[in-house]
């Protein structure tokens, strides 16, 4: 005859408020004859949690049909968990006796503790934009979780980052904990379309981590490159000069033309295009009237990008004598 074992496989069961907890208990023998009861705690003050045969336990259901002849599974489910339910639960075998049943063997117990899910991670980037090749810091925060053990990872475009520091508070015992992590990210010129992801894994999430994201587009400033060129062909007595502003981000841009130091107020044609990497190109055309012009016309294309100091490119206009002669003969 096999000696009865009471098997409670989980030492610790983490449950969240409002959910249902399943407490497992199996026996290895049908003998001796008698019921299996569930208690919370030990000793004379222990609380009866479930007795199949008698007592009112509206929150408790059995996993198996206890009336089946060879049933060896005495697992129970407790619904609508509250903080008052924490404690150690024991399944206990009784031997039928007179006048009272006699306790025969107890399981090792399962401690039920409250687990609280972490809040969705919130990722915050730097207050000001930074140019490529520089390092920026991102912070990630999540709150309200329990137990304290938690894993946080950082990713940039799916690649795990290693340069970060993480703190979990408080250090002592608490009902709930918070995590804060700061990651240092080196910006690349193509990072306009990049994302940083903060991933939090916790036992209450059952293998489905929470993620918070931030777009590097909020943190990066890609300064433009400027090129001013003169078109070889002229239109009547006008020469077309082009200012190409390339690979800048964000879109915020002011462009002004100056002719020999005098800012020109007249309208100019321009186009804005977006590159595959998320940066922008801006092309502005400026028509210079070359009739009666001296030879030393200097055009300046000045660009103020995202509130930064203005950058400019100059072009000394090349107007040949032949061009001047032609222009004086040309009809408007």
């Amino acid at each position: 005859e096999e000696e009865l074992q009471m098997i409670q496989p989980e030492k610790l069961l983490l449950v969240t408020v409002g959910k249902t907890a399943t407490l497992h208990c199996t026996v290895t023998s049908l003998l001796p004859v008698g019921p299996v009861l569930w208690f919370r705690g030990v000793g004379p003050g222990r609380e009866l949690i479930y007795n199949q045969k008698e007592g009112h336990f509206p929150r408790v259901t059995t996993v198996s049909d206890l009336t089946k002849r060879n049933n060896m599974d005495f697992s129970i489910r407790i619904s609508s968990i509250t903080p008052a339910d924490v404690g150690t639960y024991y399944c206990v075998k009784f031997r039928k006796g007179s006048p009272e049943n006699v306790e025969f063997k107890s399981g090792p117990g399962t401690e039920m503790a409250l687990g609280a899910k972490p809040s969705a991670p919130v990722v915050l980037g730097p207050a000001a934009r930074t140019t490529p090749e520089h390092t920026v810091s991102f912070t990630c925060e999540s709150h309200g979780f329990s137990p304290r053990d938690i894993t946080l990872k950082w990713f940039k475009n799916g690649n795990e980052l290693s340069d970060f520091q993480t703190n979990v508070d408080p250090t002592g015992q608490s009902v709930a904990y918070s995590i804060r992590s700061t990651a240092r990210v080196v910006l690349d010129p193509w990072d306009v379309r990049s994302q940083v992801i903060c991933e939090v894994a916790h036992v209450t999430l059952q293998g489905d981590p929470l993620r918070g994201t931030a777009n590097l587009s909020e943190a990066i400033r890609v300064p433009p490159t400027l090129e001013v060129t003169q078109q070889p062909m002229r239109v009547g007595n006008q020469v077309n000069v082009t200012c190409q502003v390339r690979k800048f981000y964000p879109q915020s841009l002011q462009l002004t033309w100056s002719e020999n130091g005098n800012v020109c107020q007249r309208e100019t044609a321009s186009t804005l295009t977006e590159n595959k990497d998320g940066t922008y190109n801006w092309t502005s055309w400026f028509l210079v009237n070359i009739s009666d012009q001296r030879d030393d016309v200097v055009l300046t294309c000045q660009v103020k990008h995202d509130g930064q100091l203005a950058v400019s490119k100059r072009l000394a206009l090349e107007v040949t004598v032949h061009q001047k002669d032609q222009s004086s003969d040309a009809t408007p």
Partner: antibody, heavy 114, light 108 residues
């Protein structure tokens, strides 16, 4: 729906015996103890005993030992209470109660009278 | 056997009044095994409070239960006309199981 349907009014003579029935529906009778409770007119409640229909094992209050006999028939989901050597003291309403304590039968009124 | 003594045997209360019924056990009863029933004339008793302090389904929240060891109580925070009934405490901590003698609660 859980129900406990008890047998009707019984009027019996002193010294006789009577067998009251309680038929369960909406649950497996073997899953719970069945209790019997006595209530005399305008009086309190007295616990007579309980039976485990699964194996017939029963417990009685000392006062009802020898007076009451509980049995159960799982095939018909019925619990029985037999009362013997009836006297006027046995005149009362008898309730059957499921072991979870929230379901009671409607009661059987027993009158012992010559 | 454990004897449960309820007091008072009869009492009346005005609507809105706070009411406390007591149940005293001759020896210690585990709180898991102390129940209360409400009974109105012509009806079967209804489970009212289980495991000392848990309200059965449908019981108004003005009812509460407390106690431990040998001293238990049922409290109505604000008496209502429909609360007029008999209340019985019940222990199933040890055989033989026993009921208290009951408290008949009337409305003034």
């Amino acid at each position: 729906e859980v129900q406990l349907q008890q047998s009707g009014v019984e009027v019996v003579q002193p010294g006789a015996s009577v067998k009251l029935s309680c038929t369960a529906s909406g649950f497996n009778i073997e899953a719970y103890y069945m209790h019997w409770v006595k209530q005399r007119t305008e009086q309190g409640l007295e616990w007579i005993g309980r039976i485990d229909p699964e194996d017939g094992e029963s417990k009685y209050a000392p006062k009802f030992q020898g007076k009451a006999t509980m049995t159960a028939d799982t095939s018909s989901s019925t619990a029985y209470l037999q009362l013997s050597s009836l006297t006027s003291d046995d005149t009362a309403v008898y309730y059957c109660v499921r072991g979870s304590y929230e379901y009671w039968g409607q009661g059987t009124t027993l009158t012992v009278s010559s | 056997q454990i004897v449960l003594t309820q007091s008072p045997a009869i009492m009346s209360a005005s609507p809105g009044e706070k009411v406390t019924l007591t149940c005293s056990a001759s020896s210690s009863v585990s709180s898991s095994y102390l129940y209360w029933y409400q009974q109105k004339p012509g009806s079967s008793p209804k489970l009212w409070i289980y495991s000392t302090s848990n309200l059965a389904s449908g019981v108004p929240p003005r009812f509460s239960g407390s106690g431990s060891g040998t001293s238990y109580s049922l409290t109505i925070s604000s008496m209502q006309a429909e609360d007029a009934a008999s209340y019985f405490c019940y222990q199933w901590s040890s055989y033989p199981y026993t009921f208290g003698g009951g408290t008949k609660l009337e409305i003034k």
